[in-house]
Interface confidence: low
Amino acid sequence: PPRGRILGGREAEAHARPYMASVQLNGAHLCGGVLVAEQWVLSAAHCLEDAADGKVQVLLGAHSLSQPEPSKRLYDVLRAVPHPDSQPDTIDHDLLLLQLSEKATLGPAVRPLPWQRVDRDVAPGTLCDVAGWGIVNHAGRRPDSLQHVLLPVLDRATCNRRTHHDGAITERLMCAESNRRDSCKGDSGGPLVCGGVLEGVVTSGSRVCGNRKKPGIYTRVASYAAWIDSVLA
């Protein structure tokens, strides 16, 4: 089943997010991802936990998962590099780099997204865009076309309240509000974009969606700049 957790959003403008990737297992959407270099897609490490014996591929240039689109192309994965400290039972270090079998053919609908290298928290209240093909309602309906939602960044202290995530949000993680609008199952690995720059990756822990007391958790890419650079080098 798709991993992760867009509720309360709307259909995205077609191909307006050319960095958006669908990480697929045996031809079906599993997780979101974001093109960060011509041959590399960043996603969430836990996404591959369900992929023990399947074919992992990456779909780029897509709006609809099912309809033919001239910009769509499915790439095989040459190499999967989960963060060395990621573990199945924690949300920490939940990052995965997928090296495509060849450099992506770039164009208006396929383009890497600049990612944040300055290790500083995004200001609380900043509106950030999260997109994905994750479920759109609590009944588990999966969309065919890319969805997105704008979410305000939530300060870490609030996110760490006992009633919220109870101290689990380290400096390497960030939160966004989840009051009826939220990332949800199948959005894991997708991008949280603030001011046109990749700031976070949707974590893939199992979490109730759309509940304001359980904010969305995102891995801060700036905190992992050294690791990302070392893999992409």
Partner: antibody
Framework: EVQLQQSGPVLVKPGASVTMSCKAS????????MNWVKQSHGKSLDWIGV????????SYKQKFKDKATLTVDKSSSTAYMELNGLTSEDSAVYFC????????????WGQGTTLTVSS | EIVLTQSPALMTASPGEKVTITCSVS???????LHWYQQKSGTSPKPWIF???NLASGVPVRFSGSGSGTSYSLTISNMEAEDAATYYC?????????FGTGTKLEIK
């Protein structure tokens, strides 16, 4: 213990085809890609291609695209390579080698199958 | 296709001698994608060093690997008779995977 057991040596005539096998044991066959590598006598190693045993998906080095066909039988955890239109240039030792999505180097090698093409 | 050129092609070393084999890559690759294999006559290659500098299981600590970009090397700090073999570098950076030309190391 991981093992890749390859079929025995083969002597064939030019123009013929041959299929060699590689039986895997000691691990879940579908969880790792299977590669094939050619080594001509006294020469270096030449990667032929790779197959994903789960899906049957393949990728070949350009010069082997019309020469080699990679297949698997999941039920017996066996990988196969068929070589067609054989010439003396195809005389070599052929290795099946584990490695792929979950292993980014060639970690286990079969013992090799020696192919001799001679009239 | 990425071409890997090893030097020297053949070398002879005395026991206890320091040995360095180099691998020149035609275009820059990630150090995590450069590996070394050891092959003795009549046997299959064995993984020896992976990701430029990580020794495979059972490889003596007198072996080490280093490098980045287009230049990589394998070093034996004190040559021993059992190290006589052919060594190949290999890249996992992009399809098609390619191997180096090989370095045959003999003992004096």
């Amino acid at each position: 213990e991981v093992q890749l057991q390859q079929s025995g040596p083969v002597l064939v005539k030019p123009g013929a085809s041959v299929t060699m096998s590689c039986k895997a044991s000691g691990y879940t066959f579908t969880e790792y890609y299977m590669n094939w590598v050619k080594q001509s006598h006294g020469k270096s190693l030449d990667w032929i291609g790779v197959i994903n045993p789960y899906s049957g998906g393949t990728s070949y080095k350009q010069k082997f695209k019309d020469k080699a066909t990679l297949t698997v039988d999941k039920s017996s955890s066996t990988a196969y390579m068929e070589l067609n239109g054989l010439t003396s240039e195809d005389s070599a030792v052929y290795f099946c080698v584990r490695g792929g999505l979950r292993r980014n180097y060639f970690d286990y090698w079969g013992q090799g199958t020696t192919l001799t093409v001679s009239s | 296709e990425i071409v890997l050129t090893q030097s020297p092609a053949l070398m002879t070393a005395s026991p206890g001698e320091k040995v360095t084999i180099t691998c020149s890559v035609s275009s820059s690759i990630s150090s995590t994608n450069l590996h070394w294999y050891q092959q003795k006559s009549g046997t299959s290659p064995k993984p020896w060093i992976f990701g430029t500098s990580n020794l495979a299981s059972g490889v003596p600590v007198r072996f080490s690997g280093s490098g980045s970009g287009t230049s990589y090397s394998l070093t034996i700090s004190n040559m021993e008779a059992e190290d006589a073999a052919t060594y190949y570098c290999q890249q996992w950076n992009s399809y098609p995977f390619t191997f180096g030309t090989g370095t045959k190391l003999e003992i004096k």
